[in-house]
Interface confidence: low
């Protein structure tokens, strides 16, 4: 059987090393060895390429070394297959050197920013000493900010052959470290370099982006002062390793600037207190590049009415969200602060508070927030510097069943009625919204029964129990989950109500 | 504490080669470049290559293109500068010094090695 | 090859006078000029990096003005301990190329 005509010729020229081609099929049924035909010199001459030894046989690759290779030159390539039954010959192919020559990657040798200049980083790179000196080269710039995966890319060509290449990646995010590579190839070749070896830079540290300031209010103390709680952070858009060295806070009472008091903090929250008045706080961050714009803030009068324009409140969850969207009767209002705690017995360990403009929505990912946990979330209308009267909804993220069930006692027992009394069950015990409580009782060796009653009872009476007879009670907790009992208790019915028993004495 | 420790005097014949080491102490060669400079008695300062520790990839001035080889070895954390050929003007101090690409200046320079050539 | 061109080769300056060395580069080196200075029998050490960034610990009476191709390095109120030879080099192309050196003498 002849062997299968070489098809599929594939060839690179590799700057100043050799000249290879490559065929399908890569293996033939029976020994078969190829000869590679190669005209050069545009034609003007011809030699070949031989795999017939034992080592290179049935090996579809073959390579022209140098002196032989010309460059620039068209050369054409036909490859024959030959086994002992004969000879098969490929098509006749042509290949343009220039278009199929292969370099070496660059090498970056400085990644640096450029005093003065934001956001922007200077690579230098030391073109590949194989390289043709008189090509065009053509280069992909990769990369990436150190924390991701996502590469980005920029293409571009430079022509400078006589010292170290230079580009101004621009467009970056301050202050931040970016993984960078390079690779490139002659302008008109299909065949990139690999890529250099990465190096790392650091973009400029850049003065600090404006604050989002917010406040909570706290009730006045005996001595007339009133607690304000100051926190702030970064706007919305700042760069996320911008490098505060500290803040400057001053605030004073309206119309009366004479009364200016300042702090300066590291922290991103303060504790002020103010007189009963109106009064304007200001923050600004700093760093050795200088401050931000200022942050402003009014702290109503103790007295002062507040508008109220939210007249409902919804929250719901998706796959990954908890959404919480409201409705406005004020058309004018188009910013809201956002605030969000766990609703737990004891003063709240994390409050978190967002700014929401432009928009009658606040989503939040579930992973955000502890499953299990009762969060109280707050709205507030904003209009220019008044703040209105919040509207407030607790959610879960998760339901659970309650860890723990209503403790349940008995109390006013009759001859055929009961009446039964439970606690809440504590908040941090819920796990979920209670829904509903529902009392599971059963006379010794009798039947059970069951009341369920709604989440906002916490006290209920059983009627047509059977007189002097002992039964046992417990009463179960409900989420949407699932519900827990609480401890079993025992009662027994009265033989003679107190009261007939009572009336009876009397005669 | 960041240093660079070369190697100690060396007299060698003319014609012969040296090679003066530079051991690092503090930091990891493969994060940095390491050049080499020289200074001939009472003269300013001559830069002859750089190596890239993590790759082995070196660059050349066109004066010591041939004659100076760089190498560096990163698991004892040392460079190393081959010259051969040597010749009454090679007499100097040699110099190694870290040049770490993101903030592109020598911050750390070594002790330097005198080379005398003399028959 | 860059060529660094230091002025002048030697100068001698009173404590508390300033010292001003310039450096001038053949064809634009932006901002890539380092300066060193090297005391007698020891290594070089960094000044000023990126023609104008103090380098670590080293006194703000040190400065550094220029881009393009013409550099100065300023050292106000001068102090006995300034004395050495002070260089320029260029990172900017290979081969990085330094400057013939400046003797700051101290009178």
């Known amino acids: 059987v002849l062997p299968a005509k070489p098809e599929n010729i594939s060839c690179i020229f590799y700057y100043e090393e050799n000249f290879t081609c490559t065929w399908s099929p890569e293996k033939e049924a029976s020994y078969t060895w190829y000869k590679v035909k190669r005209t050069y010199s545009y034609g003007y001459k011809s030699d070949i390429c031989s795999t017939d030894n034992s080592t290179r046989g049935n090996h579809a690759s073959c390579s022209f070394l140098p002196p032989t290779i010309t460059n620039p030159d068209n050369y054409t390539i036909q490859v024959e297959a030959q086994n002992a039954d004969g000879i098969m010959k490929s098509d006749i192919t042509y290949w343009n050197l220039d278009a199929i020559m292969k370099i070496e990657p660059p090498e970056i040798f400085s990644v640096k920013s450029v005093l003065g200049i934001k956001r922007m980083l200077q690579i230098k790179w030391i073109r590949p000493v194989l390289a043709p000196h008189s090509s065009t080269l053509k280069y992909t710039l990769r990369f990436r900010t150190i924390n991701s995966a996502y590469w980005m890319e920029v293409n571009f060509t430079k022509e400078d052959i006589d010292r170290d290449e230079t580009y101004n990646l621009t467009e970056l995010q301050a202050f931040t470290e970016y993984v960078m590579t390079l690779r490139c190839a002659p302008a008109e070749s299909m065949f990139w370099s690999g890529w250099s070896q990465e190096k790392v830079g650091t973009t400029e540290e850049e003065a600090p982006y404006g604050l989002d300031l917010w406040r909570v209010l706290k009730p006045a103390m005996v001595d007339g002062r009133r607690p304000v709680q100051l926190m702030w952070k970064k706007a919305t858009g700042a760069p996320v390793l911008e490098k505060a060295l500290g803040y400057n806070i001053w605030y004073f009472p309206e119309n009366n600037t004479n009364l200016t008091e300042t702090v300066n903090t590291t922290n991103q929250t303060h504790e002020l207190y103010l007189g009963g008045k109106t009064y304007w706080v200001y923050v600004v961050s700093y760093n050795s590049l200088g401050e931000s714009p200022v942050a402003t803030l009014r702290i109503p009068a103790l007295n002062e009415k507040t508008f109220q324009c939210i007249e409902a409140m919804q929250a719901c969850l998706t796959q990954d969200q908890l959404v919480v969207e409201w409705q406005s009767s004020a058309p004018e209002v188009d910013t809201w602060m956002v605030e969000w705690f766990p609703d737990v017995d004891s003063e709240p360990s994390s409050f978190s508070w967002e700014s929401v403009s432009q928009a009658r929505n606040w989503t939040i990912q579930k992973d955000e927030l502890k499953p299990l946990w009762c969060y109280n979330i707050s709205v507030y209308p904003v209009l220019r510097d008044r703040v209105g009267q919040p509207y407030s909804t607790q959610a879960y993220v998760q339901e659970g069943i309650p860890s723990a069930g209503p403790v349940t006692q008995a109390d006013s027992i009759g001859v055929k009625t009961v009446t039964i009394t439970w606690k809440e069950i504590p908040k941090s015990k819920r796990n979920g919204f209670i829904k509903n409580y529902t009392i599971f009782y059963q006379a010794e060796d009798g039947k059970e029964f069951s009341k369920t009653v709604n989440s906002n009872i916490l006290q209920y009476r059983l009627e047509s129990l059977t007189r002097r007879t002992s039964y046992s009670l417990q009463v179960m907790a409900s989420t949407n989950a699932g519900g827990t009992n609480g401890t079993k208790i025992n009662f027994k019915t009265l033989s003679i109500s107190h009261h007939h028993h009572h009336h009876h004495h009397h005669h | 504490e960041v240093q660079l420790v070369q190697s100690g005097a060396e007299v060698v014949k003319p014609g012969a080669s040296v090679k003066v080491s530079c051991t690092a102490s503090g930091f990891n060669i493969k994060n940095t470049f390491i050049h080499w400079v020289r200074q001939r008695p009472g003269a300013g300062l001559d830069w002859i290559g750089r190596?890239?520790?993590?790759?082995?990839?070196?660059k050349y001035a066109p004066k010591f293109q041939g004659r100076a080889t760089l190498t560096a070895d990163t698991s004892t954390n040392t460079a190393y500068m081959q010259l051969s050929s040597l010749r009454a003007g090679d007499i100097a101090v040699y110099y190694c010094?870290?040049?770490?690409?993101?903030?592109?200046?020598?911050?750390?320079w070594g002790t330097g090695t005198l080379v005398t050539v003399s028959s | 090859d860059i060529v660094m061109t230091q002025t002048p080769l030697s100068l001698s300056v009173s404590p508390g006078e300033t010292a001003s060395i310039s450096c001038k580069a053949s064809?634009?080196?932006?901002?890539?000029v380092t300066w060193f200075r090297q005391k007698p029998g020891q290594s070089p050490q960094l000044l000023i990096y990126s023609a104008s960034n103090r380098y670590t610990g080293v006194p703000d009476r040190f400065s550094g003005s220029g881009s393009g191709t013409d550099f100065t390095l300023r050292i106000s109120t001068v102090e006995a301990d300034d004395t050495g030879v002070y260089y320029c080099q260029q990172d900017y192309s290979s081969p990085w190329t330094f400057g013939q050196g400046t003797k700051l003498e101290i009178k």
């Open positions: 064809q634009s080196v932006t901002n890539d």
């Open positions: 010094a870290r040049y770490y690409y993101v903030s592109s200046y020598f911050d750390v």
């Open positions: 190596i890239d520790p993590a790759n082995g990839n070196t």
